[in-house]
């Protein structure tokens, strides 16, 4: 099951079902309010708007310049499930589309599943995939944001996420953890980390780290329930906490924010 490093060259995006939930507008992140008073704040606000203007249709990426600083971790939780599932099916959902914590603080990526039949407990698998493109660099580069974001929205594919949808051959793929019954097994890369699968299928990090930025896929596998949408994903981002972060994230509070 373990797949560390280079992907195998097949596209493995959002599992069964589209990467966008039919209730798309409902999933949009909260609007940003302008609290800045100077040019730097306005630039940060513009970048933040660019980050979120695409809503959940564009992922995020980590900025190399942010390494070594305090950080903010974002999680965009994207639903990759359809409304109804056929009989004898699994429904996997992620909730809480917007989540903020500080680097080294805990974070939980919520994932729940429903099954139509439960003779045996399913296997919960959390996989990590690195981003396809650098989301933060795009956001802070007006030319890139203007040209690419607007072009993408205008292209008529608002649900397509170029930061998430790419071949595994150009990104790192790893198994983070698996759970069957009460037994949780960490992937090789994550051995020694305080990471576990709690509750129904939530992935919990006791401490976030720089390398944690990426897309996390929650999938549930059962021999009985072969249909339905068995996978959903969450995006986890590490941002450098600079003087502009307060303006970038109005209302940001230091410390973990409860679900």
């Amino acid at each position: 099951m373990q797949q560390d490093g280079l992907g195998v060259g097949t596209r493995n995006g959002s599992g069964k079902g589209r990467s966008v939930h039919p209730s798309w507008p409902w999933c949009a992140p909260r609007p940003l309010r302008y609290f800045g008073r100077d040019a730097r704040a306005r630039r940060a606000q513009t970048a933040a708007m660019a980050l979120l203007a695409g809503g959940l249709s564009r992922g995020l990426g980590s900025h190399p310049a942010a390494a070594g600083r305090d950080a903010v971790v974002f999680v965009w939780l994207l639903l990759s499930t359809w409304c109804t599932a056929p009989a004898r099916a699994i429904q996997v959902t992620v909730s809480n589309p917007y989540h903020v914590v500080i680097l080294f603080q805990p974070v939980t990526l919520p994932c729940t599943y429903q099954m139509t039949s439960t003779p045996t407990q399913p296997i919960v698998i959390w996989k990590y995939k690195s981003f396809c493109r650098d989301r933060i660099a795009d956001a802070f580069s007006p030319a890139s944001v203007d040209n690419q974001l607007n072009a993408q929205l205008a292209a008529g594919n608002p649900g397509y996420n170029p930061y998430v949808e790419c071949q595994d051959s150009v990104r790192t793929v790893r198994v983070v953890a698996t759970k069957q019954g009460n037994a949780v097994t960490l992937g090789d890369y994550y051995q020694g980390r305080r990471i576990t699968i709690t509750g129904n299928a939530d992935l919990t990090f006791d401490q976030t780290a720089w390398g944690d930025s990426g897309v996390y896929y929650c999938s549930v596998v059962s021999a009985q329930d072969l249909q339905g949408n068995n996978e959903a994903y969450a995006e986890l981002i590490v941002l450098g906490r600079t003087s502009g972060v307060a303006e970038l994230l109005p209302g940001f509070q230091a410390g973990p924010i409860e679900d």
Epitope: G9, R11, S14, D138, S144, P162, E165, Q167
Partner: antibody, heavy 118, light 111 residues
Framework: QVQLVESGGGLVKPGRSLRLSCAAS????????MHWVRQAPGKGLEWVAV????????HYADSVKGRFTISRDNSKNTLYLQMNSLRAEDTAVYYC???????????WGQGTMVTVSS | DVVMTQSPLSLPVTPGEPASISCRSS???????????LDWYLQKPGQSPQLLIY???TRASGVPDRFSGSGSGTDFTLKISRVEAEDVGVYYC????????FGQGTKVEIK
Amino acid sequence: QVQLVESGGGLVKPGRSLRLSCAASGFTFSSYAMHWVRQAPGKGLEWVAVISYDGSNKHYADSVKGRFTISRDNSKNTLYLQMNSLRAEDTAVYYCARDSPGNAFDIWGQGTMVTVSS
Amino acid sequence: DVVMTQSPLSLPVTPGEPASISCRSSQSLLHSNGYNYLDWYLQKPGQSPQLLIYLGSTRASGVPDRFSGSGSGTDFTLKISRVEAEDVGVYYCMQALQTWTFGQGTKVEIK
């Protein structure tokens, strides 16, 4: 203006090496995966290699695996293709191309000709 | 590997008339996210290829609306509603689902 400009092509003997460069401008180079695609004289297009936006992941066509190495220097906005153990069948125009939504190639360079002949 | 097969390989056209090129893949290019990973390129004589259509049916920026892409799974079609003289060149389909593979190309020339 978004632009890709290849260089480094030329005539080389079989078994020798050559390094191609692709200078990018007009866009945030470090945000995009990049590709090399080649076209033998009078033939069709053949994908050669891809590198992720941060250089951490690379993938090659079977025909060049073990001989070619793709790399990038984001500080210089430049993509490279190191070609070793060149063969006559590597003779082609080599294009660099930018990856775009859908893994399509939305921006192409003008190409640089590589001729492998004794 | 995914094999791409185009037809016809040569297509004489009359300006103002429609034209159609077919592309077939050896396996489905429809991803579970609902998108087909099939692109169309045009390489005009002496030039680099240019992107026309991506994700099966989305026109790239600046591409005239006389070009359209359709199809799903393994069968795809590029249509030019009214051919213009500047449309001559070689058209390639390309799959982007598993690495990247081009079709052999279709040469479009004026009759």
